[in-house]
């Protein structure tokens, strides 16, 4: 069984969160994909999404969020630049597939942004203030307004956890061991 994991990223203000969500290439390559924040007890809120149909390796920028969908690699890259303390929270990637519910991707990201400069051993201090140069062709896509009712039937786990789940069905009831992920810049 595949595990739905929640990975914790501890970053400083001004740094960049740079993550990827993988998906089944054959099924979802051109589907519209979105980056959502999940606040306890609330419906997931879509912050940015790719175009529909999603274009291959074509950056879409919504504010400080940049999405890049690599169809040929089955990967959605998500960057949140110039992080602020208020960006802290739980995030997820989903694939829109109307009229069906959005398909949630692995992994969920627990982002913790703190004030001050990172001096963490192993972190790349040279690139903590990276300013990403995005091509001028960057597009802002319109995101669907609907959200899956299933994803709000219960609040997400508050700890960084591995959750056992059969293949693509998501079950957030069995919280197991805590995973702590080192700082990434």
């Amino acid at each position: 069984a595949t595990k739905l994991t929640e990975e914790k990223y501890e970053l400083k203000e001004g740094q960049t969160l740079d993550v990827k969500c993988d998906y089944t290439l054959e099924k979802f390559a051109s589907s519209q994909k979105a980056w959502q924040i999940i606040r306890d007890g609330e419906m997931p809120k879509t912050l940015a999404c790719t175009e529909r149909p999603s274009k291959n390796s074509h950056p879409v920028q919504v504010g400080r969020i940049i999405l890049e969908d690599y169809h040929d690699h089955g990967l959605l890259r998500v960057r949140m630049v110039n992080l602020q303390v208020e960006d802290s929270g739980l995030y997820q990637c989903v694939i829109y597939q109307p009229p069906k519910e959005p398909h949630m991707l692995f992994d969920r990201i627990r982002l913790v942004v703190t004030k001050g400069f990172s001096g963490t051993p192993g972190s790349n201090e040279n690139s903590t203030q990276n300013v990403y140069k995005i091509p001028p062709t960057t597009t802002k896509a319109l995101c669907p307004l609907y959200t899956s009712p299933r994803t709000v039937t219960q609040a997400p786990p508050k700890s960084t956890a591995d959750v056992s789940t059969p293949d693509s069905e998501i079950n957030l009831t069995n919280v197991t061991d805590i995973i702590r992920v080192p700082v990434f810049n």
Epitope: K3, T5, D22, F106, N126, K133
Partner: antibody
Framework: QVQLVQSGAEVKKPGASVKVSCKAS????????INWVRQATGQGLEWMGW????????GQTQKFRGRVTMTRDTSINTAYMELSSLRSEDTAVYYC???????????????WGRGTLVTVSS | DIQMTQSPSSLSASVGDRVTITCQAS??????LNWYQQKPGKAPKLLIY???NLETGVPSSFSGSGSGTDFTFTISSLQPEDIATYFC?????????FGGGTKVEIK
């Protein structure tokens, strides 16, 4: 001991397929991507694609699309790379390499298998 | 695809010499650059990630610098055990691409 152990050398005829295995030990197999990189004799390194051992999802470069299949068996912490329709130009050493955490855009390879030499000859 | 051009393709230097290898990307790679060492008959070994970060256990005689499209790898004092081929690799965009390699030999 943290390591990736690959299967032994193979000699194949043109048109045949080869399946190379890569067994991980000493770390949580499902937490890190497995990548496949090949190197023809005396040549440079060529990235073929990646596998997320947790989800089972994979991606390949355009060059290998339709010819390469990457799979895993999490019960034995092993990744596989199968290359079909072999031709003489596929003669190379095939490496598996551990990438970053499955969710991180961190494509550096800090752990490598010793490589599997695949010779394609009629 | 992003092209990574390494130079020189080979070099010969004396023990104790400072050795410099350059890697040029065909476009800005936002500091997503790694360096590997490969000894004959062996698998590559990660030395430096993200331009200048030394991998655990790698001697401080190795260093990396640069930004944008131009990057440099330096061995401050060449030792006999440094005889190898060195490769740069970018990961700003997929597909991941490597430089052609620089073979370092002892005079």
């Amino acid at each position: 001991q943290v390591q990736l152990v690959q299967s032994g050398a193979e000699v194949k005829k043109p048109g045949a397929s080869v399946k190379v295995s890569c067994k991980a030990s000493g770390y949580t197999f499902t937490r890190y991507d497995i990548n496949w990189v090949r190197q023809a004799t005396g040549q440079g390194l060529e990235w073929m694609g990646w596998l997320n051992p947790n989800s089972g999802n994979t991606g390949q470069t355009q060059k290998f699309r339709g010819r390469v299949t990457m799979t895993r068996d999490t019960s034995i912490n092993t990744a596989y790379m199968e290359l079909s329709s072999l031709r003489s130009e596929d003669t190379a050493v095939y490496y598996c390499a551990r990438g970053g955490y499955t969710s991180a855009w961190r494509w550096y390879f800090d752990l490598w298998g010793r490589g599997t030499l695949v010779t394609v000859s009629s | 695809d992003i092209q990574m051009t390494q130079s020189p393709s080979s070099l010969s230097a004396s023990v104790g010499d400072r050795v410099t290898i350059t890697c040029q990307a065909s476009q800005d790679i936002n500091n997503h650059l790694n360096w590997y060492q490969q000894k004959p008959g062996k698998a590559p070994k990660l030395l430096i990630y993200d331009v200048s970060n030394l991998e655990t256990g790698v001697p401080s005689s190795f260093s990396g610098s640069g930004s944008g499209t131009d990057f440099t790898f330096t061995i401050s004092s060449l030792q006999p055990e440094d005889i190898a081929t060195y490769f740069c690799q970018q990961y700003d965009k997929l597909p991941l691409t490597f430089g052609g390699g620089t073979k370092v030999e002892i005079k």
